[in-house]
């Protein structure tokens, strides 16, 4: 039961993650208009990953594309990029995770098919929070080397009254929304890893022992504990015996030192 | 038709407050913010305040801030212009408008006066 | 606050003549975000409200003659008049729409000459 509770709540976990991760690529507050410590303006600008806006205080709102490729930063591409390839990844292993589930039967699939593609939707997963946890974190930081920048020339001008305001942006919603869903998307590929673990069979029949019924005589292979990493066939370890009524998840558990004759 | 009209004006003595209203009809007045502006006798337009739309920000000139206080009622599309401790200076003709694309003021109504006398 | 200065305070013109009005602010009102300037020009007939002209400093408003034109960027900018007729007559104001507190020129003042 456990197994299960844990490889639903990595699912679920990553989906949220993964719609999260979707949902801050397509925002577009990326980054927003430092309000403080500037003049009140009566235009407040933001920008995203594949346009920039401008709301007026009048509710007027006008958004842009980004109509270039070779003319946006290297940095910003990087982020797509690295967003784009972090959704990829999410997708596939939300795709492959959804047959993996233990609670969805799909014909004959054994339980180590089963584990070996909760193994993989679970690196899939970590690996798309990776890359959305870093794309936010280098679009981060290129704010804060910006921001810093801006603020040392705020005010450039010709000398005398006439001033230029230079605009600096902070921190959007979207790197908040990114930071989170990237974690989130980690936190259930960490669990779909360990839910793998459990899901996997064990070459050890040390269950054959437990209830051995007089009269009759049982086969028992040896073989000491391997720790299956959910990839590899695991066909041959077919159950010889079992001797009591038992839920899937029981029949999954560790061998303890007791397990042993 | 967009329309705009204030009401509420007249004479005061200083001191004094006076509540400016303006009916707002022919936009959707919720999705709009609106402002006040102001002409003395015979001078140039003041911007007095501002109202955004949504979470209705509001913008003062620094000779009426703390004053001056404006609100929006949407389901009633109206403006208020609640003025208190009026002073001589603040006799003009009160314009209620609507602002645009640009922040620019593309719609005035007739304007309401008020003046401030002992 | 922003300075608006508009200059001249006042003209004499002939129908048919072409006009410039001056308008200096401050600071720039280029907003960076979407390279538009927030400046406003307003036309004024006596006993009458303002009526918006040009707004986004070059945008004419619909309805608004095509003989009316702004231009400039930045802190410089200059309404035009390419053809001054007698309905003309008013009173021109520059507008800061950039930044609070939303500042006007003192006007230019139009005249049949």
């Known amino acids: 039961m456990a197994v299960t509770a844990c490889q639903g709540l990595g699912f679920v976990v990553s989906l949220i993650g993964i719609a999260g991760i979707i949902a801050a690529t397509c925002m577009d507050q990326w980054s927003t208009q430092d309000l403080y410590n500037n003049p009140v303006t009566a235009v407040f600008n933001y920008q995203g990953l594949w346009r920039s806006c401008v709301r007026e205080s009048s509710g007027f709102t006008e958004c842009r594309g980004y109509f270039t490729l070779l003319g946006l930063p290297a940095m910003l591409q990087a982020v797509r990029a690295l967003m784009i390839v972090g959704i990829v990844l999410g997708a596939i292993g939300l795709l492959v995770s959804i047959f993996a589930l233990k609670c969805i039967r799909i014909g004959s699939m054994e339980d180590s098919a089963k584990a070996n593609m909760t193994l993989t939707s679970g690196i899939m997963f970590i690996v798309s929070g990776l890359c959305a946890i870093a794309g936010v974190s280098v679009f981060a930081n290129m704010l804060v080397t910006n921001f810093w920048m801006s603020t040392a020339n705020m005010y450039t001008g010709m000398g005398g009254m006439v001033q230029t305001v230079q605009t600096r942006y902070t921190f959007g919603a979207a790197l908040f929304v990114g930071w989170v869903a990237g974690g989130l998307t980690l936190i259930g590929g960490v669990m779909m890893c360990i839910a793998c673990r459990g899901l996997a069979p064990e070459e050890t029949n040390y269950k054959a022992v437990s209830y051995h019924a007089s009269g009759h005589s049982v086969a028992y292979k040896p073989g000491g504990f391997k720790a299956s990493t959910g990839f590899g066939s695991n066909t041959k370890n077919k159950k010889i015996y079992d001797g009591g009524a038992r839920t899937e998840d029981e029949v999954q558990s560790y061998p303890s030192k007791h397990d042993y004759v | 038709e967009v329309q705009l009209v204030e009401s509420g004006g007249g004479l005061v003595k200083p001191g004094g407050s006076l509540r400016l209203s303006c009916a707002a009809s022919g936009f959707t007045f919720s999705n709009s913010a609106v402002s006040w502006v102001r002409q003395a006798p015979g001078k140039g337009l003041e911007w007095v305040s501002t109202i955004t739309s949504g979470v209705s920000y509001t913008y003062y000139a620094d000779s009426v801030k703390g004053r001056f206080t404006i609100s929006r009622d949407n389901a009633k599309n109206s403006l208020y212009l609640q003025m208190n401790s009026l002073r001589a200076e603040d006799t003009a003709v009160y314009y209620c408008?609507?602002?645009?694309?640009?922040?620019?003021?593309?719609?005035w109504g007739q304007g309401t006066s008020v003046t401030v006398s002992s | 606050d922003i300075v608006m200065t508009q200059s001249p305070s006042s003209l004499s013109v002939s129908p048919g003549e072409r006009v410039t009005i001056s308008c200096k602010s401050s600071?720039?009102?280029?907003?960076?975000?979407?390279?538009?300037?927030?400046l406003t020009w307003y036309q004024q007939k006596p006993g009458q409200p303002p009526k918006l002209l040009i707004y986004w400093a070059s945008t004419r408003e619909s309805g608004v003659p095509d003989r009316f034109s702004g231009s400039g960027s930045g802190t410089d900018f200059t309404l035009t008049i390419s053809s001054f007729q007698a309905e003309d007559v008013a009173v021109y104001y520059c507008q800061n729409d950039y930044f609070y507190p939303l500042t006007f020129g003192a006007g230019t003042k139009l005249e049949l000459k």
């Open positions: 408008t609507r602002q645009f694309k640009g922040n620019a003021l593309d719609y």
């Open positions: 600071q720039s009102l280029l907003n960076s975000g979407n390279q538009k300037n927030y």
